[in-house]
């Protein structure tokens, strides 16, 4: 009995439907075929749990948070193997293990072994504004969100005609900061912040009004 | 009580101009964005433009860049839209929206009764 | 542009019952919701705004609640004064967006 070589890992957006690949060859007919579907959660790697199981020509539930979101891609028994699992969420990332047995057939490599990541595009941002808005004035825009597998990366543009900052903004991209030092009336404006990974953008938009100081009356 | 009056509206020809006007009273206008919005017939709302408080700033929706202009006066407490190159398809009710203050940008916390628009030869 | 979805476009109903119109976004928009009514002839009135609050006059019997993609506003007990058309419109992105309008009519 052999289980072929699987691509590595599987990644999928979170919601949908994860395929995990795991098939093999035999010499035997498939009246004995026992299979075992393990994950490693990459959340808790000190905590294997069974998905599912086919034995004995039937099929068996594994961990409750799988029930009815796993099954089999084909009828079993089948050489492939492969199962999809519906509706995938964040805790679904893990090292997933197929251990197949076909007796009388022994020997050869009986496991199969595919990582799975379930990627999350960014939430909304929160941009906000520290520092004093007063002319001559330091202040850093902030933006980050509170979701986003891969972490996201942050990107502010000036809504105006250029979509430039102003010259005298410095940004981190990764933090999702603009310092702009010595604020003056052509920093004012409305800015957006755009938190992107590699399945998706969101974005939040902050308003920046210097004031002036208000002339003394004499 | 915050109050926005328009008025300019009317029946306009394919490629005329038209500049509405909306009078804000009831608040401090010059700390406000202002924005306006509009509504063809039996259709949705659309946002059109944008201005900050001090004017400094101005947006506009792609459907309009380069023939709408927003601009204000303070002093007059006045919003105002100049409409060029109008087509068919500018034909709508126009509203124009206060924004509610700071963080908020891009909410439209009051609105004017709006000005009909009608562009047709 | 971020687009918006409300659903249903039209529904029927009668004074007493509890309405619900949903509202999804393109894209994750986290709070930056609000929602306006608008009578026939009448300008649009901010109703709700950030997805939850009430806007200040706005009687009680109108919620909002959702964050992300997914919002509902409801009408907890529908009044005759009540029957118009909704709207839900985002402030996370430019261009500020609508969604197409829910019209809520006498059964």
């Known amino acids: 009995l052999e289980v072929s070589e699987s691509p590595g890992s599987v990644q999928v957006a979170r919601g949908q439907t994860a395929v995990l690949p795991c098939a093999f060859s035999t010499s035997a007919a498939l009246l004995n075929l026992n299979v075992i579907w393990m994950v490693i959660p990459l959340s808790n790697a000190n905590q294997p749990e069974q998905v599912i199981l086919y034995q004995g020509g039937q099929m068996f539930d594994g961990a409750l948070r799988f029930h009815g979101r796993v099954g089999f891609t084909g009828t079993m028994p089948a050489t492939n193997v492969s199962i999809f699992i519906n509706n995938t969420q964040l805790s679904d990332t893990g090292t997933y293990q197929c251990l197949v047995n076909n007796l009388p057939d022994r020997g050869g490599r009986n496991i199969g072994v595919t990582g799975l990541t379930v990627l999350v595009p960014p939430s909304a941002p929160q941009c906000q504004i520290q520092g004093s808005q007063d002319l001559g004035s330091d202040v850093i825009l902030l933006c980050s969100s509170e979701e986003g597998i891969p972490r996201p990366t942050y990107l502010w543009e000036k809504l105006d005609n250029t979509l430039k900052l102003p010259p005298t903004a410095t940004q981190d991209q990764v933090q999702g900061t603009v310092t702009i030092r010595n604020i003056s009336a052509l920093s004012s404006g409305l800015y957006q912040c755009v938190a992107s990974n590699a399945i998706g953008t969101s974005t939040c938009l902050l308003d920046l009004q210097v004031i002036s100081p208000q002339p003394r009356s004499v | 009580e915050v109050q926005l009056l328009e008025s300019g509206g009317g029946l306009v020809q394919p490629g005329g101009s038209l500049r509405l006007s909306c009078a804000a009273s009831g608040f401090t206008f010059s700390s406000y964005a202002m924005s306006w919005v509009r509504q063809a017939p039996g259709k949705g709302l659309e946002w059109v433009s944008a201005?900050?408080?001090?004017?400094?700033?101005?947006y506009y929706a792609d459907s309009v860049k380069g023939r709408f202009t927003i601009s204000r006066d303070n002093s007059k407490n006045t919003l105002y839209l100049q409409m060029n190159s109008l087509r068919a398809e500018d034909t709508a009710a126009y509203y124009c929206?206060?924004?509610?203050?700071?963080?908020?940008?891009?909410?439209?916390?009051?609105w004017s009764q709006g000005t009909l628009v009608t562009v047709s030869s | 542009d971020i687009q918006m979805t409300q659903s249903p476009s039209s529904l029927s109903a009668s004074v007493g019952d509890r309405v619900t119109i949903t509202c999804r976004a393109s894209q994750s928009i986290s709070s930056y919701l609000n929602w306006y009514q608008q009578k026939p002839g009448k300008a649009p009135k901010l109703l709700i705004y950030?997805?939850?609050s009430l806007q200040s006059g706005v009687p009680s019997r109108f919620s909002g609640s959702g964050s992300g993609t997914d919002f509902t506003l409801t009408i907890s007990s529908l009044q005759p004064e009540d029957f118009a058309t909704y709207y839900c419109q985002q402030r996370s992105g430019s261009p500020l967006t609508f969604g197409q309008g829910t019209k809520v009519e006498i059964k």
């Open positions: 201005i900050s408080g001090s004017g400094g700033s101005t």
């Open positions: 950030a997805a939850s």
């Open positions: 929206a206060r924004m509610a203050a700071g963080a908020s940008w891009g909410t439209f916390d009051y």
